[in-house]
């Protein structure tokens, strides 16, 4: 027979030859690391056939770590379920409850002995440290010091010293999460209001007020003759601008009565545009011009449609 | 305080043009839009147009042709200019702000008279 | 363009009286109503806006109220110091538009 097998878990005594006889018997010990648990032979033997007669290692069993109990508020849970060396615990903690020291555990083997990697870890309840006060704004529960998880406060603005109100900007409730911080920003109050929003040639239909606070949302249609430029639909933001912003309504184009001349690569043409009357201030652009970021009324249209009038 | 003041010609023949100045105080240009409106003696009030925070202009269509509203933000000067006047253009002419960013008028300048007349 | 039309043209009241000024507009305005005072010196004044709401400085003496095309003025009170004449203007259709205007006498 040639050199005899070899396993994972055992190892062959003494040194390997490279030729053996029929009938000579080799014998295995336990690896570092595991130990042997009878009946199962750690022998084998070169027959006939000039193969080894079956064995395997499965006698020898991996040295296991001490059992780890479930930390309190929480579970310790074995990797492949079991404790062997070269595996990990993993621990976690209940909901409302939070980790503190190492969230893995690995069983490792010091000399033939197996122990964990360090000590196992705690579960400590999640406590918040009381919400962030906001200007111009007040929060429930401002007396108390230690909130606990999942405990929530509500914030509301103050009345304005002025003729605006503030605007709770955000969410209003917030609530005590994990890793003991609170689940999202506190919200801000301040005055957002817009202008009143200006379409000519068209009207507001939705949306009436006497002033326009956040999240106010109108709607608008164009006369008789015009079509919408932009959303029907605009709604005040947090910046105090209009999102999307104020539509135009622009002059429907008169269907075309003369086909243009077919024009060829060699024939030079000059474009003439007829400035619209309505430019009291010298010609007009017959593009159109970029629309302004002010948060304010649109400007009149001053694009190509308008010099068809 | 808020004031507005509007200096004009006075007098304009037929056919020529009007410019009238409004100087503002207590205020900035950036931040208030401001509408001229005229008053004929013994009538009523018009709108004539207005000029927005950012530039930006409308005008009454009745106007639109031989009407310009223009300012110079840093010497707080709103200009009116008017084309072709007529006797029936003969008016107060007041310079007005809006409150803020609404379109009602709160202040008002005293108005200044023009008289077309030959 | 909204017209809008002023009623009566001119009044007289007495001291002390309860007067009312209307104005209707020529289509739906849903409130974007403006009441000015002109006094005979010719300086203007805002006194309410979108319809009933005061503007800062203006006694409480003065009210307005309406919808749809219909709204009014109210001088609870009359005094001396009113005597002016009144003008409605529509705010939410360009071209901004003004109330012919209605003339306030003492009896």
């Known amino acids: 027979c040639e050199e005899p097998p070899t396993f994972e878990a055992m190892e062959l005594i003494g040194k390997p030859k490279p030729y053996y006889e029929i009938g000579e018997r080799v014998d295995y010990k336990c690896k570092k690391g595991y130990f042997y648990i009878p009946p199962l032979a750690t022998h084998t033997i070169c027959d006939r056939n000039h193969t080894w007669l079956p064995v395997s290692d499965d006698a020898c069993y991996r040295e296991t770590c001490p059992y780890i109990r479930d930390p309190l508020n929480g579970q310790a849970v074995p990797a492949n379920g079991t404790y062997e060396f070269g595996y990990q615990m993993h621990f976690i903690c209940n909901e409302g409850y939070y980790l503190i020291g190492e969230e893995i555990l690995y069983c490792e083997l010091k000399g033939s002995v197996a122990i964990w990697s360090g000590k196992p870890p705690i579960c400590e309840k999640v406590l918040c440290t009381p919400p962030p006060k906001i200007k111009n704004g007040k929060h429930t529960f401002s007396e108390v010091e230690v909130f606990e998880y999942l405990d929530a406060v509500t914030y509301s603005c103050d009345p304005a010293p002025g003729p605006d109100p503030f605007s709770l900007i955000g969410e209003s409730t917030i609530y005590c999460g994990d890793n003991s911080v609170w689940s999202r920003a506190a919200p801000e109050c301040k005055v957002v209001k817009c202008r009143f929003p200006v379409v000519e040639n068209g009207k507001q239909i939705s949306g009436f007020g006497k002033k326009f606070y956040y999240k106010a949302t109108v709607m608008f249609e164009c006369d008789k003759g015009f079509y919408l430029d932009g959303s029907d639909t605009i709604v005040c933001d947090s910046n105090s601008t209009w999102d999307p912003p104020v539509p135009k309504c622009l002059k429907v184009l008169p269907p075309s009565s003369t086909k243009p001349p077919a024009l060829s690569h060699s024939v030079s043409t000059s474009s003439t545009t007829k400035s619209p009357a309505s430019s009291a201030s010298g010609p007009r652009p017959t593009y159109k011009p970029p629309v302004s970021n002010y948060p304010g009324y649109p400007k009149p249209e001053e694009g190509i449609l308008d010099s068809l009038d | 305080q808020v004031q507005l003041k509007e200096s004009g010609p006075g007098l304009v023949a037929p056919s020529q043009n009007l410019s009238i100045t409004c100087t503002v105080s207590g205020f900035s240009l950036t931040s208030y839009d401001i509408s001229w409106i005229r008053q004929p003696p013994g009538k009523g009030l018009e709108w004539l147009g207005v000029i927005w925070t950012d530039g930006g202009t409308n005008y009454n269509s009745a106007f639109m042709s031989r009407l310009s509203i223009s300012k110079d933000n840093s010497k707080s000067q709103v200009f009116l200019k008017m084309n072709s006047l007529q006797t029936d253009d003969t008016a107060i002419y007041y310079c007005?702000?809006?409150?803020?960013?609404?379109?009602?008028?709160?202040?008002w300048g005293q108005g200044t008279l023009v008289t077309v007349s030959a | 363009d909204i017209q809008m039309t002023q009623t009566p043209s001119s009044l007289s009241a007495s001291l002390g009286d309860r007067v009312t000024i209307s104005c209707s507009a020529s289509?739906?305005?849903?409130?974007?109503l403006n009441w000015y005072q002109q006094k005979p010196d010719g300086t203007v004044k805002l006194l309410i806006y979108?319809?009933?709401s005061l503007h800062s400085g203006v006694p409480s003496r003065f009210s307005g109220s309406g919808s749809g095309t219909d709204y009014s003025l109210t001088i609870s009170n009359l005094e001396p110091e009113d005597i002016a004449t009144y003008y409605c203007?529509?705010?939410?259709?360009?071209?901004?538009?003004f109330g012919g205007g209605t003339k306030l006498a003492i009896k």
């Open positions: 203007q529509q705010y939410i259709k360009l071209p901004w538009t």
């Open positions: 007005v702000r809006v409150y803020d960013g609404y379109p009602w008028f709160a202040y």
């Open positions: 979108y319809t009933s």
């Open positions: 289509q739906g305005i849903s409130n974007y």
